[in-house]
């Protein structure tokens, strides 16, 4: 016998659908209504042949009873071909949920998503999180996407975008988000993110996340945020190849002194990068390839430094300097 | 190890009704989601009708507006009311708990619709 595709835990709390035949039973995803965190993989499915079977213009409000009665807080949904009418109609249903946290990974969105109706209320997710999601429409994906949801949303994860820069002047502000991650977008680079930082759309940013999204130097981040007007109070720059030495030509920067928290590990980094802020609560500068203890003078004024990991540390080789503050323990970099 | 035992099948005219039942017994702790399955003869197993552990419930397309699936006040009991019964519902009705790991299947019963 074939394995049931969806398992629903005993505490009737986490449900995980894999549907991966050519013609799934879909109703085996029911037992995840009364989970609340649920997942549902689709395989590479084509979704197309249920706008036939759902009418994705019908009121939402028949269906508002039911879906008030789900539990589902966390929502994953992956590996398909959506049609943009279909998750339109997912998004409207969904909107009288108690949904939180919606991510969607590996999707390939065909169409154009339809505008709001004036009677349709949004979904008030405060995270969103999409993973090699795909869009027809290119650019305008981000505020097609937006307004179908309630301006209330705190955190956005974008990664492995195809179209990682939005078209700003159709976006609204995001008044409440407070944490942006573009990670995964290699080939973001600093141009790419004065792209995707919209200006003046992201008033409240704490937490900016640019892992792995090629980019070459703190100074040219910092660029791009002045450019942008976000300031965030943590910003994590790991795992790109950083270069430590900034252009000549390049205008001098100056970081927010909203910025206490800086995260430069697996960079590369051989010396401690200039133009780094003068002053930071947390530097991490864990596994890098730092030879020698960095000299005060080559740091901004910090409390919480991280050197973990640098082959200045490694036993047998040169001592840390005295007041470098790290854990004793060796991190597997 | 949870059994599932049906009840309630049998031999009816067209258009007339029947009520089947379904008691799961053994080591369930919770209450789960479970459902009401059919096999025709010579035909696939089908969803019929399911009901959520909070209550929520769901219906095959042939059925919808005909049969009602609710709980019993026991932790585990499920009913099926079947009406304006028509000869394409004639199969054997197998009972379904949702339980991590692997399902509980019931032996089934027969529903024979008589034209």
């Known amino acids: 016998t074939t394995p049931e595709p969806c398992e629903l835990d005993d505490e009737d709390f986490r449900c995980v659908c894999n549907f991966s035949e050519p013609q799934p039973d879909w109703s085996e995803a029911f037992q995840c209504v009364s989970a609340v965190e649920v997942e549902i993989h689709a395989g590479g499915l084509n979704l197309e042949p249920f706008l036939k079977r759902v009418d994705a213009d019908a009121d939402p409000r028949q269906y508002a009873d039911t879906v008030k009665a789900l539990r589902v807080r966390r929502l994953t949904v992956g590996a398909a071909q959506v049609p943009a009418q279909l998750l339109v109609g997912a998004l409207r249903v969904l909107a009288y949920s108690r949904l939180k946290e919606l991510t969607l990974e590996d999707l390939k969105i065909t169409g154009t998503m339809p505008p709001l109706p004036l009677e349709a209320t949004g979904l008030a997710l405060s995270s969103l999180r999409l993973r090699n999601v795909s869009w027809a429409t290119g650019r305008s994906w981000l505020a097609e996407l937006q307004q179908w949801l309630k301006p209330g949303l705190k955190v956005l994860s974008i990664a492995q975008a195809h179209s990682p820069a939005f078209s700003c002047e159709q976006v609204r502000a995001f008044p409440a988000l407070t944490s942006l991650d573009l990670s995964d977008n290699p080939g973001l680079g600093e141009r790419g993110l004065m792209a995707a930082l919209c200006p003046h759309k992201f008033p409240a940013i704490q937490n900016l996340a640019l892992r792995n999204t090629g980019m070459e130097t703190p100074t040219g981040v910092c660029a791009a945020l002045a450019a942008a007007g976000v300031q965030p109070h943590s910003l994590d720059l790991s795992h790109n190849s950083l270069r430590a030495t900034v252009n000549p030509s390049a205008p001098r920067c100056m970081w927010s002194s909203a910025l206490n928290s800086l995260n430069l590990s697996f960079a590369g980094l051989e010396q401690v990068p200039k133009g780094l802020p003068a002053k930071l609560r947390v530097l991490d500068l864990s596994c890098n390839r730092l030879n020698r203890a960095p000299q005060p003078d080559e740091l901004p004024e910090v409390d919480n430094l991280t050197l973990d990991g640098n082959p200045f540390l490694v036993p047998g080789t040169a001592l840390p300097h005295e007041g470098s503050m790290n854990s004793g323990v060796v991190p597997a970099c | 190890q949870v059994q599932l035992q049906e009840s309630g099948g049998g031999l009816v005219q067209a258009g007339g009704s029947l009520r089947l039942s379904c008691a799961a017994s053994?080591?369930?702790?919770?209450?789960?989601?479970m459902g009401w399955y059919r096999q025709p003869p010579g035909k696939e197993r089908e969803m019929v009708a399911q009901?959520?552990?909070?209550?929520?419930?769901n219906y095959g397309d042939s059925v919808k507006g005909r049969f009602t699936i609710s709980r019993g006040s026991a932790r585990n009991t499920v009913y099926l009311q079947m009406n304006n019964l028509k000869p394409e519902d004639t199969a054997v009705y197998y009972c379904r708990l949702f339980k991590t790991g692997a399902d509980s299947w019931g032996q089934g019963t027969q529903v024979t619709v008589s034209s």
């Open positions: 053994g080591r369930i702790f919770s209450i789960r989601p």
């Open positions: 009901i959520s552990s909070n209550g929520i419930t």
